[in-house]
Interface confidence: low
Amino acid sequence: IWELKKDVYVVELDWYPDAPGEMVVLTCDTPEEDGITWTLDQSSEVLGSGKTLTIQVKEFGDAGQYTCHKGGEVLSHSLLLLHKKEDGIWSTDILKDQKEPKNKTFLRCEAKNYSGRFTCWWLTTISTDLTFSVKSSRGSSDPQGVTCGAATLSAERVRGDNKEYEYSVECQEDSACPAAEESLPIEVMVDAVHKLKYENYTSSFFIRDIIKPDPPKNLQLKPLKNSRQVEVSWEYPDTWSTPHSYFSLTFCVQVQGKSKREKKDRVFTDKTSATVICRKNASISVRAQDRYYSSSWSEWASVPCS
Amino acid sequence: RAVPGGSSPAWTQCQQLSQKLCTLAWSAHPLVGHMDLREEGDEETTNDVPHIQCGDGCDPQGLRDNSQFCLQRIHQGLIFYEKLLGSDIFTGEPSLLPDSPVAQLHASLLGLSQLLQPEGHHWETQQIPSLSPSQPWQRLLLRFKILRSLQAFVAVAARVFAHGAATLSP
């Protein structure tokens, strides 16, 4: 058993049929010595008396808010949550496996630049009695500070018969060094509590591996005289790290016909302009990627040829 | 060419070669960035390789003030990785093809380190640990780890030379 926060405790249980459970001793936070009784949740049934209460925690029915009283007065509370371990693996019932980039990916994180700011998000089908708490650090043996905000509900989607809820959090490394080569990964820890079930989820990454620039901005076409060619130009996204002579991007320019089956023409360039042939009813799209490290491409910025 | 305490390197040549290094490092193992090879002891093991750290003067301001600190750090790293790529980890079984990107990467690391330090000038270099993994899975694991770490190192080096070529070239 360990303390999650004041008066909230997590009991770790091996979860299998006829498991013996864990013996837990609760102590009433009071100078009083006698006349103390214990109850669980809203029940008035007295579970025991005395300053301490010993219970065998085996299932969710044994978890909840234990309260010690004297006379009609509440002296203190202890909320017991359960953390299930099945076949040696901690349960992951609360969050949905996003399966990207690999199985057992519950947390996904992205950064728009090298400033040390990043966003993580996760999915669940649970709509009520759900709380999240997020902590982060750079490295784990001698952790350096990363400050995370509160997790908020950022999107709701309907998936078949189910509703899916997306939560996200923004974090910022306290002393980020954008130009340095990271040697210690960022660790993100999410505590999730649904009713009386506790679970924790972690993700470990380097900012460089989660970089995804915003799409290029100000995408414009300039027709070239007496030609089907056009000059496409664009600019670095505002959110990208500066100076651009140091934090450089590379770009992919694509000409795509109306039909998905039509052959796509692609040009790769380090410049912020390119000359392409504009076909009728086609569109021109440009996306960006870090020039020197193969992290994710940005989403496409597009304009129609006409 | 960068000489200890001396003149500027051939920024444009260094830029071209460092950008080539980036391409080669990713073609040597394109999956490296997406492989989950971070074990328990990874924090310790990453410290075996030289990293370009915050105080090494490789940021735009540091390069403007005095690029020598940063160039020396990059040189150390290039020599270190060049030795690693020439070691038993990469030369032993499972053997790589003679024209593999690793062979080209090895040659390019050497080329860039020589651009930075001509014969006769010696910056201190970091000791390379003596490595003799004996099993294929060990070698594969170490190759992945080294290449992934090299990808990060050459990305920073390439940024330095790109910025130098754009702003510090005579």
């Epitope: - | 328990e40 002891g41 093991t45 490595l131 993994p133 004996s134 099993q135 694991l141």
Partner: antibody, heavy 117, light 108 residues
């Protein structure tokens, strides 16, 4: 001539953990990998994972990921395999073996781990 | 992971006969890093062949290994009484090394 000597038999309760040791003598320990292989009664050999003591790199079979921890202490030339959340199916003989370029050439005598309530 | 399938599961032969054991891999074994082990009841396995065809130190010449890619064979040219045991193949050419399920060579 390298020899690997393992710790003695263990009887464990379901849900508990077991830690088996494997001490090398008569040769260099650090440069080789030590692999752990188990064999359930009447069954075949199953590789669990291995470690290169010199680097501390451990590599685990997918099946045991999260439940097994392999460590090595170079100062005593000893490798350890800890398996947690034991269940009856983990009853087996656990072997350590020196894992060299030519397969597993030296094996420990085996440690029987019995999981029973 | 590479799956190794050994056949037959049991081989019933008499002393002096030739034994041919097969090991098939679900995908090509990198560098032909395939080993064969012999195991007798109550004993640890013993390395016989490594690298598909090289005999380990002290292994009699009647044991030979062959094959490459996905098909490998262990041959015992003339069975001696002490050769009746279980034989396992083992690929160690990938990050996750695997064993076959074993072939039992028993006295007919």
């Amino acid at each position: 001539q390298v020899q690997l000597v393992q710790s003695g038999a263990e009887v464990k309760k379901p849900g508990s953990s077991v830690k088996v040791s494997c001490k090398a003598s008569g040769g260099t320990f650090s440069n080789y990998a030590i692999s752990w292989v188990r064999q359930a009664p009447g069954q075949g050999l199953e590789w669990m994972g291995g470690i290169i003591p010199m680097f501390g790199y451990a590599n685990y079979a997918q099946k045991f990921q999260g439940r097994v921890t392999i460590t090595a202490d170079e100062s005593t030339s000893t490798a350890y395999m800890e398996l947690s959340s034991l269940r009856s199916e983990d009853t087996a003989v656990y072997y350590c073996a020196r894992d060299i370029y030519a397969g597993m050439d030296v094996w420990g005598q085996g440690t029987l781990v019995t999981v029973s309530s | 992971d590479i799956v190794l399938t050994q056949s037959p599961a049991t081989l019933s032969l008499s002393p002096g006969e030739r034994a041919t054991l097969s090991c098939r891999a679900s995908q090509s074994v990198l560098g032909n890093y395939l080993a064969w082990y012999q195991q007798k009841p109550g004993q640890a396995p013993r390395l016989l062949i490594y690298g598909a065809s090289s005999r380990a130190t002290g292994v009699p010449a009647r044991f030979s290994g062959s094959g490459s890619g996905t098909d490998f064979t262990l041959t015992i040219s003339s069975l001696e009484p002490e050769d009746f045991a279980v034989y396992y193949c083992h690929q160690y050419g990938s990050i996750s090394t695997t064993f076959g399920q074993g072939t039992k060579v028993e006295i007919k």
